[in-house]
């Protein structure tokens, strides 16, 4: 959470941003809020990126103006125009690229004054893991798969029954480059699993942490997955 202040004569407004992460190839949001102003035509929003000449996006007089936009953002940006009057200057970013990572500035000018705040935007790839029982294996094993990760994550297994056990000797993890040559598919196999136990496959890089749980009993298989972005907010 970053709060910035600006001074215009005697007037300053508070601008607030949140550090966030973007998933390559998906759509992202760079969050920014400011003190609302009912005079839409008097609001100017500028998004800038450190090291880039030109703007990421500009919204003024109630509409977009991309005449100064840097070409790397062409066709990929928009503000939530109907929410600007209530103080939302967040930026939509289409088709997030690895090169979109960096420091952004959200600059606001209204009839009340002006202000700005920076945010760090991280980019990578992260996805939910899915665990299945691998019945083809000679001994009962679990297969944990996640389709898109970058940078290369670490993978670890855990078990409810054998808490603290190191499963690295009885697991095998591989990383397969996807067709776009950036992200990778993660596959990890855990061997010699026992029935009536809950196993967890944990995949983590510096952007996200994902966990897949599976409980195998004689009568059923229960699964659960969750994904958490790291250092956000």
């Amino acid at each position: 959470l970053i709060i910035g202040f600006g001074i215009s004569g005697k007037h300053f407004i508070t601008v607030t941003t949140f550090t966030s992460a973007g998933n390559i190839g998906e759509d992202g949001t760079l969050s920014c809020t400011f003190e609302p102003d009912i005079k839409l035509n008097g609001i100017v929003i500028q998004w800038l990126k450190e090291g880039i000449k030109g703007l990421v996006h500009e919204f003024k007089e109630g509409k977009d103006d991309l005449s100064q936009q840097h070409e790397m953002f062409r066709g990929r940006t928009a503000v939530f125009a109907d929410q600007v009057v209530v103080g939302n200057a967040s930026l939509r970013l289409k088709n997030v690229q690895l090169t979109d990572a960096g420091t952004y500035t959200c600059y606001i000018r209204t009839s009340k004054g002006k202000g700005n705040a920076n945010l760090e935007y991280k980019t990578g790839a992260f996805s939910m893991p899915e665990i299945n029982v691998d019945y083809n294996a000679s001994s009962e094993s679990l297969r944990c798969e996640a389709p898109r990760w970058f940078p290369q994550p670490t993978v670890a297994w855990a078990s409810q029954v054998d808490q603290g056990a190191n499963f690295s000797e009885v697991s095998n993890t591989s990383f397969e480059l996807n067709s776009e040559n950036v992200t990778m598919k993660v596959v990890s196999v855990l061997y010699n699993v026992t029935i009536n136990n809950t196993y967890s496959c944990m995949i983590e890089n510096d952007i996200a942490k994902a966990t897949g749980d599976i409980k195998v009993t004689d009568s059923e298989v229960k699964r659960r997955s969750q994904l958490q972005l790291l250092n956000s907010g």
Epitope: D64, L66, E71, G75, R76, A78, K94, N95
Partner: antibody, heavy 121, light 107 residues
């Protein structure tokens, strides 16, 4: 209500330059919320996006045509134009001008009627 | 470039039929897909944007679904004015590309 209308020669000789203009009426192409595109359709075939232009004059061209395409805009006349050089029979098509529905959406919500350009000697 | 593959290339149907057209992208495009209707001698008309959003003025019998690489256009009850060619278009990555089209003909 905004309307688009293409104009230009219907017949162009091989190796010459195809020139088309799209005139907007009932609205301004200087509205910052839109990109303006050219799209073509070969006879009986599918659609091919040629490129787009912003009111400020910045452009993006389809790499397959980039070496031959030039787009320009004249906001005082509320027009934008397409030039395609060194044409061959393969450039015979109906050419459409169109509006992208927003700065991010890149779907085409408003089209001209289209103009058939034949490349022949 | 992202390739857009439509199927079938043509379909014969009767008034009142439910018609489904599919479009597959060669790589993930999230929900950045549009559908158009084109009648002979006319410009294409936008029906669906963002995979499932109905363009203003388009009848509710048209619907779109899908995300990632696989998308569907459905006409719930075919009307006489719906006989036309339909195109999908990816709006995710430059250069924007269209599918080859699906012609909906009278059976």
């Amino acid at each position: 209500q905004l309307q688009l209308q293409e104009s230009g020669p219907g017949l162009v000789k091989p190796s010459e330059t195809l020139s088309l203009t799209c005139t907007a009426s009932g609205g301004s192409i200087s509205h910052g919320g839109y990109y303006w595109s050219w799209i073509r359709q070969h006879p009986g075939k599918g659609l091919e996006w040629i490129g787009n232009i912003y009111y400020s004059g910045s452009t993006y061209y389809n790499p397959s045509l980039k070496s031959r395409v030039t787009m320009s805009v004249d906001t005082s006349k509320n027009q934008f134009s397409l030039k395609l050089s060194s044409v061959t029979a393969a450039d015979t098509a109906v050419y459409y001008c169109a509006r992208e529905s927003s700065t991010i959406s890149a779907d085409f919500d408003l089209w001209g009627r289209g103009t058939l350009v034949t490349v022949s000697s | 470039d992202i390739q857009m593959t439509q199927s079938p290339s043509s379909v014969s149907a009767s008034v009142g039929d439910r018609v489904t057209i599919t479009c597959r992208a060669s790589q993930g495009i999230s929900r950045w897909l549009a559908w158009y209707q084109q009648k002979p001698g006319k410009a294409p008309k936008l029906l669906i944007y963002a995979a499932s959003s109905l363009q203003s003025g388009v009848p509710s019998r048209f619907s779109g679904s899908g995300s990632g690489t696989d998308f569907t256009l459905t006409i719930s009850s075919l009307q006489p004015e719906d006989f036309a060619t339909y195109y999908c278009q990816q709006a995710h990555t430059f250069p924007y590309t269209f599918g080859g089209g699906t012609k909906v003909e009278i059976k």
